[in-house]
């Protein structure tokens, strides 16, 4: 017969669970079963046998069940035995996460991860994560082996930050036992981090002010930062430092205040983990009356103008008014009182009205005084700009700016600007003698350039008032600049050429640069050097030139700024005519004769005359004197063709003749080979 045990060889059971071992036989009708432990300790289990099967049940599994169990089956005289080892473990719960206190930003906290009722502890491992970050991990393999359930923990201290809000804290416990189902050997607990911020930066804003008048109202708003958002409580400190609770809102409004409402008000921000307070002191004062003087503490009045000073009592039902000057000089004005107002009218102010005026208001035996300074000035006209002459590029010019009838001139500033550039600035700070109207002048010299055209010359006069007035009185004059440029780069173009043949047309064109555009004047220079005016056109035209049109022609560019002059010489030439080529004594001579070849041109004295003898090897120029060439003793080789060319710049004429030379012996003619 055969014996089998199930599960085979080895099994694992969790403490507190139930576990069944089954022993069965085949090939035996009525076997006898017996169970024992390898070391013969108590079974700590129940046995139930039915036919060929015996079941050993451990319920609940405990440390006493960690053994090798043996099943013995007897069939007749046969006996068979099988063993199975039972390992036990305990891993019943998910780990627990504990904190040493609430998680407060910036304050270290210890987090503890506990794995409860573990067996065997040496097989335990714990990981602790914050989000994706491993904070710590520990294995407990060095722990003593004891047959008991133990709770093991892993601790980490960290300082929470704002970014930790909402992060998950994960505690993962693993029990490294082969046979446990993977779902059982790893347990984890996840806790979302609840991070707190104790109330801080508690601040109070008070509107309109902490110093108040009787009957007034105040609104105080308190804010406090924290997580969760702090609740706000308002209280008032009593004499014994006890707080009198006033409100549970962020805003506390007090109306119709009395002097006894003065005191220290406390605002407190409170949340789950802390509190933070701020204090403010309110001072409620008795309501005073106020004296107001208008137009202001300083009044600027132009000579001849009228000034109205108004004094008002605010917060007083029946005031009495009085006016005086600081120096107690007589008042030149008219006073009019109307209820809570009094006016002093100064008509047509002059230098004698320049004072500090004081208005005194009496209300229920209390007198308040307010002053205003009346400053007299004169600044009636815009400045006047004058220049020493027209503006010419590169030529210095003097500009003066005159400001008439000014008072007080020791407050005067004159500035002269060219475009955006200050040419000169002057403060007239010299001591004033008697009070009078004065005319002040600012003078400067500058060199205009062409770039200044289009810019403006600005004379700016500022009359600065007393310290109180921020903006000075200002007047200005503007003069656009137009800079002249003396004519320059005067140029003459001659078309077609300054050397011409008699009868040809010619154009002489002149241009000149300058501002304003120069006027053109054509003249002819006479022999005595004087100029004979010809034309005011830019172009001087000769339809048909004559020989006596030759000469020097002068073009002048003229404008307000100067003159520029340029000249050109015109040469009129005559083309050669009536050219004559003669031979003496005759065209046919004997060997040894003297021969004279002459070339003359009747109409042109200044001409080039070239005498040539034609030859196979090329023309040979003959040395002629005044167009004549003499052959002293004619040779046979002197025979040939002679050519005369008369040339000027405008043309040329050509004549030729043939000279024969006869030999002495046989009277034969000798002709050149041409």
């Amino acid at each position: 017969f055969k014996i089998e045990i199930s599960p085979e060889y080895k099994t694992i059971a969790q403490i507190g669970d139930s576990m069944a071992l089954t022993c069965s036989t085949t090939g035996c009708e009525s076997p006898l079963f017996s169970w024992r432990t390898q070391i013969d300790s108590p079974l700590n289990a129940k046995v139930r046998t039915e036919g060929s099967k015996s079941v050993l049940t451990m319920e609940p599994v405990s440390f006493e069940n960690e053994h090798s169990y043996l099943c013995t089956a007897t069939c007749g005289s046969g006996k068979l035995e099988r063993s199975i080892h039972v390992d036990i473990y305990s891993f019943p719960k998910d780990p627990e996460i504990q904190f040493s206190g609430p998680l407060e930003v910036g304050k270290p906290v210890t987090v503890k991860c506990l794995a409860p009722d573990i067996y065997p502890v040496y097989r335990l491992e714990i990981d602790l994560f914050k989000g994706d970050q491993l904070m710590n991990r520990q294995e407990f393999s060095s722990e003593e082996m004891t047959k008991s359930l133990e709770t093991k923990s892993l601790e980490v201290t960290f300082t929470p930050v704002i970014e930790d809000i909402g992060k998950a804290l994960v505690c993962r416990a693993k029990l490294h036992i082969d046979q446990i189902d993977s779902t059982l050997k790893e347990r984890e607990t996840v806790k979302e981090l609840q991070v707190y911020i104790s109330p801080r930066n508690t601040t109070i804003s008070v509107h309109p002010s902490t110093r108040l008048q009787e009957g007034g109202a105040v609104t105080m708003t308190c804010s406090s930062e924290g997580l969760p958002a702090p609740e706000i409580f308002w209280g008032r400190k009593l004499d014994n430092e006890v707080l009198q609770l006033l409100s549970g809102n962020a805003t506390l409004t007090l109306i119709a205040m009395r002097m006894e409402d003065s005191g220290v008000y406390v605002c407190e921000g409170v949340n789950l983990i802390g509190r933070d307070k701020a204090e403010v002191e309110l001072v409620v004062q008795e309501k005073p009356f106020i004296v107001d003087i208008s137009p202001g503490s300083q009044v600027a009045a132009q000579v001849g103008d009228s000034v109205v000073l108004t004094c008002a009592a605010i917060g007083c039902d029946s005031p009495s008014f009085s006016w005086r000057t600081q120096t107690d000089s007589p008042l030149n004005g008219v006073v009019r009182n109307e209820g809570a107002k009094s006016t002093l009218v100064l008509s047509s102010v002059g230098f004698e009205d320049e004072h500090s005026y004081l208005c005194a208001v009496t209300c229920l035996q209390r007198t308040l005084e307010k002053r205003t300074q009346v400053e007299v000035y004169s600044f009636p006209e815009d400045p006047v700009i004058k220049m020493s002459g027209p503006l010419v590029h590169g030529r210095p010019v003097t500009v003066n700016c005159t400001v008439p009838n000014v008072y007080p001139f020791d407050h005067l500033e004159i500035e002269l600007l060219k475009g955006e550039t200050t040419l000169m600035k002057k403060y007239f700070l010299e001591e004033m003698g008697i009070k009078s109207l004065e005319t002040k002048i600012l003078e400067t010299t500058f060199i205009p350039t062409i770039e200044d055209t289009g810019k403006s010359l600005v004379c700016l006069a500022r009359l600065h008032s007393g310290e109180m007035e921020s903006e000075p009185k200002q007047r200005q004059s503007v003069q656009p600049l137009y800079v002249n440029v003396a004519p320059k780069e005067t140029t003459i173009w001659v078309s077609p050429s300054p050397i011409l043949e008699e009868g040809s047309p010619v154009n002489l064109t002149c241009s000149s640069d300058g501002i304003p555009a120069p006027k053109i004047l054509w003249s002819r220079q006479l022999n005595n050097g004087e100029l004979q005016p010809l034309s005011e056109n830019t172009t001087l035209t000769f339809m048909s030139t004559k020989r006596d049109d030759s000469g020097i022609y002068v073009c002048e560019g003229i404008n307000e700024a100067g003159i520029s002059r340029k000249s050109v010489e015109l040469i009129i030439q005559v083309s050669p005519k009536d050219i004559q080529l003669t031979v003496f004594p005759s065209k046919s001579v004997k060997e040894g004769d003297t021969v004279i070849i002459s070339c003359t041109c009747g109409n042109v004295p200044e001409t080039w005359i070239i005498l040539k003898k034609k030859a196979k090897t090329g023309d040979m120029v003959l040395k002629s004197v005044d167009g004549s060439y003499t052959i002293r003793q004619a040779q046979l080789q002197d025979a040939g063709i002679y050519e005369c060319e008369s040339k000027t710049e405008v043309g040329s004429q050509l004549r030729s003749l043939t000279l024969d030379v006869k030999g002495k012996e046989h009277n034969k003619d000798y002709f050149s080979p041409e």
């Epitope: 491993l134 710590n136 520990q138 060095s142 601790e155 082969d178």
Partner: antibody
Framework: QVQLQESGGGLMQPGRSLNLSCVAS????????MTWIRQAPGKGLEWVAS????????YYPDSVKGRFTISRDNAKSTLYLQMNSLRSDDTATYYC???????????WGQGTLVTVSS | DIQMTQRPASLSASLGETVSIECLAS??????LAWYQQKPGKSPQLLIN???SLQDGVPSRFSGSGSGTQYSLKISGMQPEDEGVYYC?????????FGGGTKLELK
């Protein structure tokens, strides 16, 4: 008594691979975490890798993560360290120790020298 | 990672002299500290674990103490066989880290 015997060290070129072994005896091998620790010449000790009882959990420092693999064969009572993409700064004596990353290292092998040089 | 700093880096002691080696952790390690001795050319040997528990077979002249971030190893009466390098190691926070070592020589 507990004995740990490393082998497999030697001279290797950078970028190459090497496998170290450690044969354990004198204790029930599968009842302990095992760890490799190294010591560069003339330098201190550095933890290299740890493996749990069955090999289910393995841990490494950033310096070797992704290049080294620790494993074990409980049937052969042998611990391994597969070292890939070797670098010159991996030159060290490699010790096989009994114990996990949180435990004191009570038993050490005699060490095997790995030299990485071109 | 927790930094472990050992002081001094090296020291010489006369025979019978009492020697102290300090180990400083960059944060609290709750006594999870071990001390090792490494003799020239040998493997390290565990002397003390849990900051103060002496391993079996380790002479009683060796003792460990400390808490929080400060720990020390004391040798009460230096012997020739105590020459070597001593290392501390924390196992409190992953990953495990060692001190740089203290070289102890006999004067």
């Amino acid at each position: 008594q507990v004995q740990l015997q490393e082998s497999g060290g030697g001279l290797m070129q950078p970028g190459r691979s090497l496998n170290l072994s450690c044969v354990a005896s004198g204790f029930t091998f599968n009842n302990y975490w095992m760890t490799w620790i190294r010591q560069a010449p003339g330098k201190g000790l550095e933890w290299v890798a740890s493996v749990s009882f069955t090999g289910g959990s393995t841990y490494y420092p950033d310096s070797v993560k992704g290049r080294f693999t620790i494993s074990r064969d409980n049937a052969k009572s042998t611990l391994y360290l597969q070292m890939n993409s070797l670098r010159s700064d991996d030159t060290a004596t490699y010790y096989c120790t009994r114990g996990g990353y949180s435990s004191p290292f009570a038993y050490w092998g005699q060490g095997t020298l790995v030299t990485v040089s071109s | 990672d927790i930094q472990m700093t050992q002081r001094p880096a090296s020291l010489s002691a006369s025979l019978g002299e009492t020697v102290s080696i300090e180990c400083l952790a960059s944060e609290d390690i709750s006594n999870s500290l071990a001390w090792y001795q490494q003799k020239p050319g040998k493997s390290p040997q565990l002397l003390i674990n849990g900051a103060s528990s002496l391993q079996d077979g380790v002479p009683s002249r060796f003792s460990g103490s400390g808490s929080g971030t400060q720990y020390s190893l004391k040798i009460s009466g230096m012997q020739p066989e105590d020459e070597g390098v001593y290392y501390c190691q924390q196992g409190y926070k992953y990953p495990p880290t060692f001190g740089g070592g203290t070289k102890l020589e006999l004067k």
